[in-house]
């Protein structure tokens, strides 16, 4: 018979014959012959491959190196990589989370619209009319302005995105 | 047609080294492991060595076999080596070149080694 | 390194015979083992492999059994061509080291 051009879903062209991939998790260890099947071998520990595959050698899993920051947050497989994520208070600086820097704090005069995680970063917006923050944080929100009214004062002094109004006795008419 | 050839058996004095090749054809050698072993006149097959294959070069031993005996290749010649030094006489044997590494689904017909005075 | 221990050393049988021949691995080697046949001035023949996968070509009055450490060759019906030296070879994987081992053999001769 005429010898294959193309071969089947999860095989591969060798020889001019079709031979089986290696499933994941397992690496190609020799060819398949006429007489035996592909032979593949498992990944060691600390190794992984996560596809169908002819590949001699398994991947290293990914080290979450503390010294970056980094700590595991779900430990590898013969069949998939480490994902690592950053400490409390730090955030990866790229999707393939190879290193970590601080969570960005807000200045005064901005809130935190979004708490950061371990893959984004804080998020800052400007405190709009009738908020303010004086603190420069990664978790405070801007806060609204105090209500003299509801506490029967008056406003003795305007508030900013920075301050908060300062409340005082409304003037009382003397007799 | 696909095959395992091997060369460079003789006599050799206790002490002495040995080189054996193997030449491989008619599949890719650098994806297959290779392995040798041997058989002593009259006795049963003894494991001694394996390379892994792809390019990084991984070698496993027989514990007997390690520091005296070295395996290589050479995937441009497709050829696999067994370097033999400090031989001795309980070395006398076929060795066999064979394709794979936990099965061996080709072998060449051997060489033999004979370490006598 | 993983030690085979393969049993019978010999055995006598007759055409038609039903043959078993046992491997026993020091230690677990999961589904890795492999059976071989040699005949006098020939290289040895993979007949099978992990523990019950018939290479192809091969009769099935061969078969296989086992898993970690205790294994099987079965002959269902001996043959004329049968009468040959049977090895079982076994492969251990760690993460520190690869081993090979073969059995001593079994030599299946005419009654």
């Known amino acids: 018979p005429e010898p294959p051009t193309a071969c089947r879903e999860k095989q591969y062209l060798i020889n001019s014959q079709c031979c089986s991939l290696c499933q994941p998790g397992q690496k190609l260890v020799s060819d398949c012959t006429e007489f035996t099947e592909t032979e593949c071998l498992p990944c060691g520990e600390s190794e992984f491959l996560d596809t169908w595959n002819r590949e001699t050698h398994c991947h290293q899993h990914k080290y979450c190196d503390p010294n970056l920051g980094l700590r595991v947050q779900q430990k590898g497989t013969s069949e998939t990589d480490t994902i690592c994520t950053c400490e409390e208070g730090w955030h990866c600086t790229s999707e393939a989370c190879e290193s970590c820097v601080l969570h960005r704090s807000c200045s005064p005069g901005f809130g935190v619209k979004q708490i950061a995680t371990g893959v984004s970063d804080t998020i800052c917006e400007p405190c709009p009319v009738g908020f303010f923050s004086n603190v420069s944080s990664a978790f405070e929100k801007c806060h609204p302005w105090t209500s003299c009214e509801t506490k029967d004062l008056v406003v003795q002094q305007a508030g900013t995105n920075k301050t908060d109004v300062v409340c005082g006795p409304q003037d009382r008419l003397r007799a | 047609e696909v095959q395992l050839e091997e060369s460079g058996g003789g006599l050799v004095q206790p002490g002495g080294s040995l080189r054996l090749s193997c030449a491989a054809s008619?599949?890719?050698?650098?994806?297959?492991?290779m392995c040798w072993v041997r058989q002593a006149p009259g006795k049963g097959l003894e494991w001694v060595a394996c390379?892994?294959?792809?390019?990084?070069?991984?070698?496993y031993y027989a514990s007997w076999a390690k520091g005296r005996f070295t395996i290589s290749k050479d995937t441009s010649k497709t050829t696999l080596y067994l370097q033999m030094n400090s031989l001795r006489a309980e070395d006398t044997a076929v060795y066999f070149c064979?394709?794979?590494?936990?099965?061996?689904?080709?072998w060449g017909q051997g060489t033999l080694v004979t370490v006598s005075s | 390194d993983i030690v085979m221990t393969q049993s019978p050393s010999s055995l006598s049988a007759s055409v038609g015979d039903r043959v078993t021949i046992t491997c026993q691995a020091s230690q677990s080697i999961s589904s890795y083992l492999s059976w071989y046949q040699q005949k006098p001035g020939q290289a040895p023949k993979l007949l099978i492999y992990l523990t019950s996968t018939l290479a192809s070509g091969v009769p099935s009055r061969f078969s296989g059994s086992g898993s970690g450490t205790d294994f099987t060759l079965t002959i269902s019906s001996l043959q004329p061509e049968d009468f040959a030296t049977y090895y079982c070879q076994g492969y251990y994987s760690s993460s520190s080291y690869v081993s090979n081992g073969f059995g001593q053999g079994t030599k299946v001769v005419i009654k």
């Open positions: 008619g599949f890719d050698f650098s994806t297959n492991a």
């Open positions: 390379i892994a294959a792809g390019s990084s070069i991984i070698t």
């Open positions: 064979a394709r794979g590494l936990s099965r061996f689904a080709l």
